[in-house]
Interface confidence: low
């Protein structure tokens, strides 16, 4: 088992290293509907938490330039061209941007208003808008660059419930599983292992940039020939899992402690826990608010 | 020098519904840096603390009054204002408005307080 | 919601004296703790924020410590202008309950 001890935690790095973009980059073409992903889980049903999407950067406090803004039973302000496709009385609040030009790039902020202060979860996505090309755009609307499905799991609630984003439909995506024990440490760090708040949060990585995914080819062969002669088959190249790794691997990685400038997870210390058979979960402390969504999901306390 | 001034009828009668205003002055009311709140005071008692809302209108209100209470802004003028429905002799009260706000993550708690003012409830 | 309790409710003292204050939250808070001071007749005014962080303007024989649930504040050399009641406050959660007061007086 120990011997699996340096490439896992490599691998691991690697994983980190690719996801630590400043912003993830969601594109549309001129004319078509832009898509930016937003989730949280109500802690019951109908028990929503208000949400805003403004353009620009989140602020300190709300959003800047309101576009669309849902409170604890509907959708209250919207205005035109801006809507929310999927159900956010489930917790999709997912924006779609009808009909996009050329000035709707730019920065969206998409504002989980959880109850508490600075519990609020801030996530900065940037809508890059590309010119309408000559020949026919395909008949899809979503033309965006990371599609993230998502997975979610409070503490003691048992196995986690998995919902997938068919946008990339034949791309396998990788599957790290997190628990979150802080959301941020701003300089009055709140503790929401104290007030029992403690949320695991369920990261997909999407394989969708350019240079991602051929990063991800070369690393696919890499664990092809690593693995080839082990039991599990990778079938797909574009393929990292970690969900057959031994959980030393994680150990040994969470010994370092990873950190990203823009995206900084701490990895703790002795923390890993076997949730079900051949899938390792690790423990992950989010020091500060991560800048891109990273397709999560908030399973709220 | 941000100042804080509440108004609105002092006696109330029960059932009725409390509305008292609070006017901001000498401050950014529309900044995204404050939220704003009302606190109430029963005589010779402590401090209960009603609700707040932040600039662009989200609201959170006490879980105990929160099926009658209402807080709304009213940008135009720097007022935000408070409504308590179905009141009863228990609402008697001094009522602060106040003002909170955030130094980059640090959260400022109310530094800026109205003088108050007492609402009876009465028949 | 979260409770906050005070201790003790009524604190004689006499000019000089150094006084503490205790402040016990119902569930962790962090540092999300504030102190306020309210005369007879008077708004709150804000003493301490983050538990520990003087308010511009208040003299520094006020101090605040603590983190987690229990809390205190600290008046070095009492002075007559400090008898009053002190108030804690959380905002670690909504709603943002304060403690039921600490009333300190001319023994």
């Known amino acids: 088992m120990f011997s699996h001890l340096p490439f896992d935690c490599v691998l691991l790095l690697l994983l980190l290293l690719l996801t630590r973009s400043s912003e993830v980059e969601y594109r549309a073409e001129v004319g078509q509907n832009a898509y930016l992903p937003c989730f949280y889980t109500p802690a019951a049903p109908g028990n929503l938490v208000p949400v805003c999407w403004g353009k620009g950067a989140c602020p300190v406090f709300e959003c800047g330039n309101v576009v669309l803004r849902t409170d604890e039973r509907d959708v209250n302000y919207w205005t035109s061209r801006y809507w929310l496709n999927g159900d956010f009385r489930k917790g999709d609040v997912s924006l779609t941007i009808e009909n996009v030009t050329l000035a709707d790039s730019g920065i969206y902020c998409c504002r989980i208003q959880i109850p508490g202060i600075m519990n609020d979860e801030k996530f900065n996505l940037k809508l890059v808008i590309k010119p309408a090309k000559v020949t026919p755009a395909p008949t899809r609307q979503r033309d965006f660059t990371a599609a993230f499905p998502r997975m979610l799991t409070t503490r003691g609630h048992g196995p986690a419930e998995t919902q997938t984003l068919g946008s990339l439909p034949d791309i396998n995506l990788t599957q790290i599983s997190t628990l979150a024990n802080e959301l941020r440490d701003s300089r009055l760090a709140n503790d929401l292992r104290d007030s029992g708040a403690t949320i695991r949060i369920g990261i997909y990585i999407g394989a969708g940039i350019c240079a991602g995914l051929a990063l991800a080819l070369i690393f696919g062969a890499l664990i092809f020939k690593w693995y080839s002669h082990s039991k599990e088959k990778i079938q797909n190249l574009s393929l990292i899992s970690l969900a057959n790794l031994p959980p030393s691997g994680l150990a040994n990685a969470v010994a370092e402690g990873i950190r990203s400038e823009e995206n900084i997870y701490t990895i703790e210390e002795n923390v890993y826990e076997v949730e079900e058979p051949n899938e390792y979960y690790c423990y992950v402390s989010s020091r500060q608010q991560p800048s891109q969504p990273l397709g999560c999901r908030f399973a709220m306390p | 020098q941000v100042q804080l001034q509440e108004s609105g009828p002092g006696l109330v009668k029960p059932s009725e519904t409390l509305s008292l205003t609070c006017t901001v002055s000498?401050?950014?009311?529309?900044?995204?840096?404050?939220?704003w709140g009302w606190i109430r005071q029963p005589p010779g008692k402590g401090l209960e603390w009603i609700g707040i809302?932040?600039?662009?209108?989200?609201?959170y209100y006490n879980p105990s009054l929160k099926s009658r209470v209402t807080i709304s802004a009213h940008t135009s003028k720097s007022q935000f204002s408070l409504k308590l429905s179905s009141v009863t002799a228990a609402d008697t009260a001094v009522y602060y408005c106040?003002?909170?706000?955030?130094?980059?993550?640090?959260?400022?708690?109310?530094?800026?307080w109205g003088q108050g003012t007492l609402v009876t409830v009465s028949s | 919601e979260i409770v906050m309790t005070q201790s003790p409710s009524f604190l004689s003292a006499s000019v000089g004296d150094r006084v503490t204050i205790t402040c016990r939250a119902s569930?962790?808070?962090?540092?999300?703790l504030a102190w306020y001071q309210q005369k007879p007749g008077k708004a709150p005014k804000l003493l301490i924020y983050?538990?520990?962080t003087l308010e511009s303007g208040v003299p520094s024989r006020f101090s605040g410590s603590g983190s987690g649930t229990e809390f205190t504040l600290t008046i070095s050399s009492l002075q007559p202008e400090d008898f009053a009641t002190y108030y804690c406050?959380?905002?670690?959660?909504?709603?943002?309950?304060f403690g039921p007061g600490t009333k300190v007086d001319i023994k």
């Open positions: 809302f932040y600039y662009s209108g989200t609201t």
């Open positions: 406050q959380q905002l670690n959660s909504y709603p943002f309950t």
């Open positions: 983050a538990a520990s």
């Open positions: 569930q962790g808070i962090s540092s999300y």
């Open positions: 000498g401050g950014s009311f529309s900044s995204s840096s404050y939220y």
């Open positions: 106040a003002r909170g706000g955030e130094y980059f993550d640090r959260l400022l708690p109310f530094d800026y």
